[in-house]
């Protein structure tokens, strides 16, 4: 069988697939999916090893006409180093020379300088290029390599091994070298595998059943350390309650040296976030961080300092904390939109059970803002989804800018944020360099602002205007009310009428529905319209809704289903990678965020047309 | 250790070094020209495992803050007589895993 990192090399035109024969013999035959000394798959960002000999792709030399065979893998051979030119074409790294069978009459596959049909190769079964299984580099834990990467193969007691390997233990614990030869070299560690006993890497905070990884032998940069959790389904840490901090510093109160956490600035809009996404609301920075110097956009938590956290350059290189586990954020159920018959008193508007207003004329301090609201049926407001916050820019006449109070603030307990109605949080969203809590300013309250209505904390003494929220009134049946210009069903939005397509369709499918509605899968032309999307469809229970966007017309490049320009994307972390497809927005914790689909999977799909009666602006020149 | 038949004795193990976590200890012996067997086991769960031979005379136990891990012999028989080494499983800076003790010779015999 197959594992996922293991591939098959065809090529199309002979329909043959490579096949080690020995190792001074790479030729081809009829593909097949059993045969070992057909398999072959990637063990750096750029050798291929042959499975069955745990050797690697190599020619003698960067010439014309060489014979490619097996050789022991050697990762700063240049003679082995493979690269993947455009689309199919598989050459040799740095040069125009390329893989290449059937000419001649040579029976072996050859290094070659045409690029014709010869020198293409897919993985067998697919039509993806060989890149598209690319190595991903395991991160070793504890051992004595500093947490370096496996090096695969790996030579051990004079045996070759191309995987983690129990040898030499009787607990079956999985282990690698992070060299070629451990026999010389003797550099090891542990992989982040699942293997019986390997819950004893991890320690369970009994209180929250929550697991922590102290890695301190290791030394990564910042995002090697976040790979690493990630490759155990976990992520760098995230501390969003003063009971969490006070554990962690019992568990690393023996260390001295920093510890990479989740936090980090890297987002080139927003401030500091938590890389599980939770909500950055607990605060417990050092004296004198965050230091605004650039570069310095990850955080390290400091043993030696009270468990203190410290924003540094994410390339230095300090042992790591991964978390994994059920996280307290979600016990707090948000109805969908859909869910809710929203009915609200008039200068207030409807979304997802609750009615918002904003007041921006009568400037107001926090305090007073607060005491409004209460006295109106409400509370400043509180925002537990991206999709909320899409629907207050979007939908309620939130103009860029405005400086808003809204009723996250750390009052009551200081350097701890909590929403004024006693919602818990769930989300936050700071502008960059935010939240600053300058000590010299009391900075306990917090607003909204600036064109994405992020938010920043600032002096409860400002007057400022004010976003409200009450729960909204249920009144007997729901009317639905028919938008100007739109179709009943459709809902507008600015210049045009949007509506989401209910029943599971490909991308194809989804296309030709929306054509027979007069519309198209929609195009989404600025942050505004992604704001309105992500309202319209984020708190929906479906996981994906297709957009009009695919590069099937050219491989790696995205076009809409109109002729219409991309002038703006949204897309998840890894997107669009090197995967062809269809592109579908995401709903949930990622809402909004668009990732590359298999246009033959089955999504729900918004369609989109010109609302009537609007005069269409004329396209812009460049 | 020389012991009357029907005594007791208490052994004990400790495991020093550059330990992450161990993930047994055992005990194993070996009489003069036979092979050396399993005597007791116990897990770092605290789980444990004993020869057929010594089932309710032998008890192992294990300190984990200690690293050390115990075996208390009682009702001793002539046949127990023989060297007895510890083993511990452990997680450390080589990827082996099995590291013994040098062993001590237990006699029974009045």
């Known amino acids: 069988l197959l594992d996922t990192r293991q591939f098959l090399i065809y090529n199309e035109d002979h329909k043959r697939c490579v096949d080690a024969v020995s190792p001074s013999a790479v030729q081809t035959a009829a593909c097949n999916q059993d045969a070992e000394s057909q398999k072959f798959r990637w063990v750096s960002e750029s050798q291929i090893m042959s499975v069955a000999f745990k050797l690697c792709l190599g020619v003698p030399s960067k010439t014309d006409w060489v014979a490619i065979t097996l050789y022991a893998c050697d990762s700063k051979s240049e003679f082995q180093k493979w690269e993947c030119k455009n689309d199919t074409l598989l050459g040799i790294k740095g040069e125009d020379l390329f893989f290449n069978y059937g000419n001649r009459q040579e029976k072996n596959i050859m290094l070659y300088k045409g690029s014709g049909l010869w020198s293409r190769w897919k993985i067998y079964g697919t039509t993806d290029n060989l890149c598209s299984r690319g190595y991903e580099a395991m991160y070793t834990l504890l051992g004595n390599a500093n947490g370096a990467t496996c090096a695969f193969p790996f030579k051990f007691e004079n045996k070759w091994y191309a995987d983690c390997t129990s040898a030499g233990r009787s607990d079956g614990w999985l282990w690698c070298g992070t060299t070629t030869d451990y026999d010389t070299d003797k550099l090891f560690g542990y992989c982040p595998l699942k293997f019986e006993g390997s819950e004893s890497l991890w320690n369970k905070d009994p209180l929250t059943s929550v697991s922590y990884q102290i890695n301190s032998k290791s030394a990564l940069t910042w995002h090697q350390a976040r790979k690493s959790c990630q490759q155990q389904n976990a992520e760098l840490l995230s501390i969003t309650e003063i009971h969490e901090q006070t554990y962690l510093t019992g568990l690393t109160s023996s260390l001295t040296s920093g510890l990479w956490i989740g936090l980090n600035s890297l987002s080139f809009n927003s401030g500091w976030q938590w890389s599980d996404r939770s909500p950055f609301r607990y605060l417990n920075w050092l004296p004198g961080s965050p230091s605004a110097e650039p570069g310095k956009s990850c955080v390290s938590l400091n043993p030696g300092k009270n468990a203190k956290w410290e924003n540094l350059e994410c390339v230095q290189k300090l042992g790591y904390i991964c978390k994994k586990g059920n996280t307290t954020l979600n016990s707090f159920v948000i109805p969908s939109e859909s869910d809710v018959p929203t009915h609200c008193p008039s200068q207030w508007w409807p979304y997802a059970g609750h009615c918002y207003k904003i007041h921006r004329d009568e400037k107001k301090i926090q305090r007073d803002a607060l005491t409004t609201c209460r006295k109106e049926g409400g509370d400043l407001t509180s925002i537990h989804t991206i999709e909320e916050l899409d629907f207050i820019i979007s939908q309620l006449g939130y103009e860029p800018n405005d400086e808003l109070w809204i009723g996250l603030n750390d009052i009551k307990i200081q350097m701890y944020f909590e929403w004024s109605d006693g919602t818990p949080v769930t989300f936050t969203k700071w502008l960059r360099g935010e939240p600053s809590h300058e000590n010299n300013r009391q900075e306990d309250c917090v607003v909204m602002k600036g064109k994405d209505g992020y938010w920043a904390d600032r002096g409860c003494e400002w007057p400022l205007g004010y976003i409200c929220k009450m729960k909204s009134r249920s009144q007997g049946p729901e009317i639905v009310e028919v938008e100007k210009g739109c179709r009943k069903g459709w809902k507008k939005h600015h210049f045009y009428c949007y509506m989401i397509g209910h029943t599971l369709s490909t991308f194809a499918e989804a296309n030709q529905t929306c054509n027979n509605e007069n519309a198209y899968l929609t195009t989404i032309e600025d942050r505004y319209e992604q704001a309105f999307l992500t309202s319209f469809v984020g708190l929906r229970p479906e996981k994906y809704f297709w957009t009009g966007l695919s590069d099937i017309q050219t491989k790696g490049t995205f076009q809409w289903t109109i002729e219409e320009e991309v002038r703006f994307t949204h897309w998840n972390s890894d997107m669009p990678g090197r995967k062809p497809g269809c592109v579908a927005m995401r709903t949930g914790i990622a809402g909004g965020l668009w990732d590359v689909l298999k246009c033959d999977e089955k999504a729900k799909f918004v369609c989109k047309h010109w609302a009537e009666g609007v005069t269409h602006p004329p396209k812009p020149t460049t | 250790q020389l012991v009357q038949p029907g005594g007791s004795l208490r052994l004990s193990c400790a495991a020093s070094?550059?330990?992450?976590?161990?993930?047994?200890m055992g005990w194993y012996r070996q009489a003069p020209g036979k092979q050396r067997e399993e005597v007791a086991a116990?897990?770092?769960?605290?789980?444990?495992n004993y020869a057929d031979s010594v089932k309710g005379r032998f008890t192992i136990s294990r300190d984990n803050a200690k690293n050390t891990v115990y075996l208390q012999m009682n009702s001793l028989k002539p046949e127990d007589t023989a060297v007895y080494y510890c083993?511990?499983?452990?997680?450390?800076?080589?990827?082996?895993?099995?590291?013994w003790g040098q062993g001590t010779l237990v006699t029974v015999s009045s």
């Open positions: 083993k511990a499983v452990v997680v450390t800076t080589t990827p082996y895993s099995d590291y």
């Open positions: 070094g550059s330990i992450f976590t161990i993930n047994a």
């Open positions: 116990i897990t770092s769960g605290g789980s444990t």
